[in-house]
């Protein structure tokens, strides 16, 4: 049954909102999709979760959520916010998750984000952000997940990322980024997942991924690359790589020499004609390899050290004979 305390908690539930105890004597408050144009005023100080998404909130006043020191998750997605003032999140010392996606922000709200030392997850996707100031994430030392996809970025905000050494996952997909410079992510040594798909990337600095020593997933699908991304060679822990739907015409010799942990490579929908014979050597974790329409392949690929393939598809090539060792190389 409910304790006396939970009854007290529920008396602090704003009108029309749905509230329930979170199991730790704190309150989860759901005020989503109620047509609200401003924040509710009578929130319990013991609120740990507040969902204000899918409303018509167009502005936040400074310090709109006073004394919510136990608030861990704040959802403001799907509103009409164009600007978030300094002090909007003052006093939210426990805030771990902040969702601001699907608004109309044009800039990262730098001043509002300052001093959110507990913040672990920040969603800024599906806004109109075209500029990320150099110091905008400088106080977010606990940040683990950052969404900046579906915005209007034209370049990687290199300086802004320098302070995010704890970051584990980031998406910059669905922007208008055209180039990744050397050391773009140089301080992101904890990053495991990086999504860069659906941009306009046509060139990569030779050292653009240097420093990403923990990276396991890299998504470069749906870009304008016309050369194989040799910059991946420093990614020794890479497990999943996507560069399908680009304009890459050849996969060079020793293409994946620095990526011995690769399990999955997606590179379909590229006009690949040439594949170096040694391109797929020494990939012991690789399970599937599909090469369609590589018309300039005349020799069967050398799969030395790639012994766990479960599926190999070669179509449109000009291979006239199979090496005697092919059955020894495959399981």
């Amino acid at each position: 049954g409910s304790s006396p305390r939970s009854g007290v908690l529920l008396r602090g539930c704003p009108t029309h909102c749905h509230c329930e105890p979170d199991g730790r004597m704190l309150l989860r408050v759901d005020c989503s999709d109620l047509g609200l144009s401003e924040l509710p005023s009578n929130l319990s100080v013991f609120t740990s979760y507040l969902d204000l998404s899918m409303n018509n909130i167009s502005q936040l006043l400074p310090n709109p959520l006073p004394s919510l020191r136990f608030l861990e998750e704040l959802r403001l997605a799907g509103n009409a916010l164009t600007y978030i003032p300094k002090g909007a999140f003052t006093g939210l010392y426990s805030l771990k998750v902040l969702m601001l996606q699907n608004n109309q922000l044009r800039h990262v709200p730098t001043e509002a984000l300052q001093n959110l030392r507990s913040l672990q997850s920040l969603r800024l996707d599906a806004n109109h952000i075209s500029y990320v100031p150099p110091s905008c994430f400088s106080g977010l030392h606990s940040l683990r997940h950052l969404w900046l996809d579906d915005n209007a970025l034209t370049e990687i905000p290199v300086q802004a990322f320098r302070s995010l050494s704890a970051l584990q996952a980031m998406t910059l997909a669905l922007n208008k980024i055209h180039h990744i410079p050397d050391y773009a992510f140089g301080n992101l040594s904890s990053l495991v997942v990086l999504h860069l798909h659906n941009n306009r990337i046509h060139s990569l600095g030779k050292k653009c991924f240097d420093g990403l020593h923990s990276l396991e997933t890299l998504d470069l699908n749906y870009n304008n690359l016309d050369e194989f991304p040799t910059a991946i060679r420093t990614l020794s822990n890479l497990k999943e790589l996507g560069f399908h739907s680009n304009n890459i015409r050849s996969i060079p010799e020793k293409a994946f020499v620095g990526n011995p942990s690769l399990i999955t490579i997606h590179f379909y929908d590229n006009p690949i004609q040439f594949v170096g014979r040694s391109a797929f050597q020494h990939l012991p974790e690789l399970r599937t390899l599909t090469l369609n329409g590589a018309s300039q392949i005349t020799e069967f690929p050398d799969l030395t050290g790639t012994a766990n393939l479960e599926s190999l598809t070669l179509t449109g090539a000009q291979i006239s004979s199979l090496p005697q060792t092919v059955c020894n190389q495959l399981p």
Epitope: E155, V158, N187, E253
Partner: antibody
Framework: EVQLVQSGAEVKKPGASVKVSCKAS????????IEWVRQAPGQGLEWIGE????????DYNEKFKVRVTITADTSTSTAYLELSSLRSEDTAVYYC???????????WGQGTLVTVSS | DIVMTQSPDSLAVSLGERATINCRAS??????????MHWYQQKPGQPPKLLIY???NLESGVPDRFSGSGSRTDFTLTISSLQAEDVAVYYC?????????FGQGTKVEIK
């Protein structure tokens, strides 16, 4: 602990070649560039070139391009610098270093003195 | 090639006093907001040791009396309170473009 250990001192005649080795340990060899830098007696530091071990990615200072070959063997985590057509002005301490944070040289070998003398 | 010019060539400073070394690049070494300028310390008979990377970031394990500043073409290495063990030659280096180049070095001694 990251370590770069270089081969011993060499004395060579003008026109000869020298090959200096640099054995790395304590980190993933193929994930970092190895840089080569030299220092003539009493002089400053001069960058020679770099390699990303395991790949064919190398870059050379144009000044040395025709005489220098940088290679690496990932099976032994060893990088090599070969300099041919030696002349007296190539007398120097040759260092290997790891390209670390943003390409800064964060770990260095102890250096190999190459003396070119007739 | 980018030419790196350090000043002064040598510097004598009293123990506990501030030492300042300047480095000027012949062209900007900034890219996307990062200054590709690093500082090294070299003691006699030893390889250089990284002190500062990207103009102002202290390398792990380096005492905080060392600091770096500057951008584009003009950079400074400061030792806030010189210690006896700081006697060495200090080099700046750019890796903005090949060939990577070093300054000629600044010798720091005790007055």
């Amino acid at each position: 602990e990251v370590q770069l250990v270089q081969s011993g001192a060499e004395v060579k005649k003008p026109g000869a070649s020298v090959k200096v080795s640099c054995k790395a340990s304590g980190y993933t060899f193929s994930a970092y560039w190895i840089e080569w830098v030299r220092q003539a007696p009493g002089q400053g530091l001069e960058w020679i070139g770099e390699i990303l071990p395991g790949s064919d990615s190398t870059d050379y200072n144009e000044k040395f391009k025709v005489r220098v070959t940088i290679t690496a063997d990932t099976s032994t985590s060893t990088a090599y610098l070969e300099l041919s057509s030696l002349r007296s002005e190539d007398t120097a301490v040759y260092y290997c270093a790891r390209g670390g944070h943003y390409g800064s040289l964060d770990y260095w070998g102890q250096g190999t003195l190459v003396t070119v003398s007739s | 090639d980018i030419v790196m010019t350090q000043s002064p060539d040598s510097l004598a400073v009293s123990l506990g006093e501030r030492a300042t070394i300047n480095c000027r690049a012949s062209e900007s070494v900034d890219n996307y907001g990062n200054s590709f300028m690093h500082w090294y310390q070299q003691k006699p008979g030893q390889p250089p040791k990284l002190l500062i990377y990207l103009a102002s970031n202290l390398e792990s394990g380096v005492p905080d009396r060392f600091s770096g500043s500057g951008s584009r073409t003009d950079f400074t290495l400061t030792i806030s309170s010189l210690q006896a063990e700081d006697v060495a030659v200090y080099y700046c280096q750019q890796n903005y473009e090949d060939p990577f180049t070093f300054g000629q070095g600044t010798k720091v001694e005790i007055k």
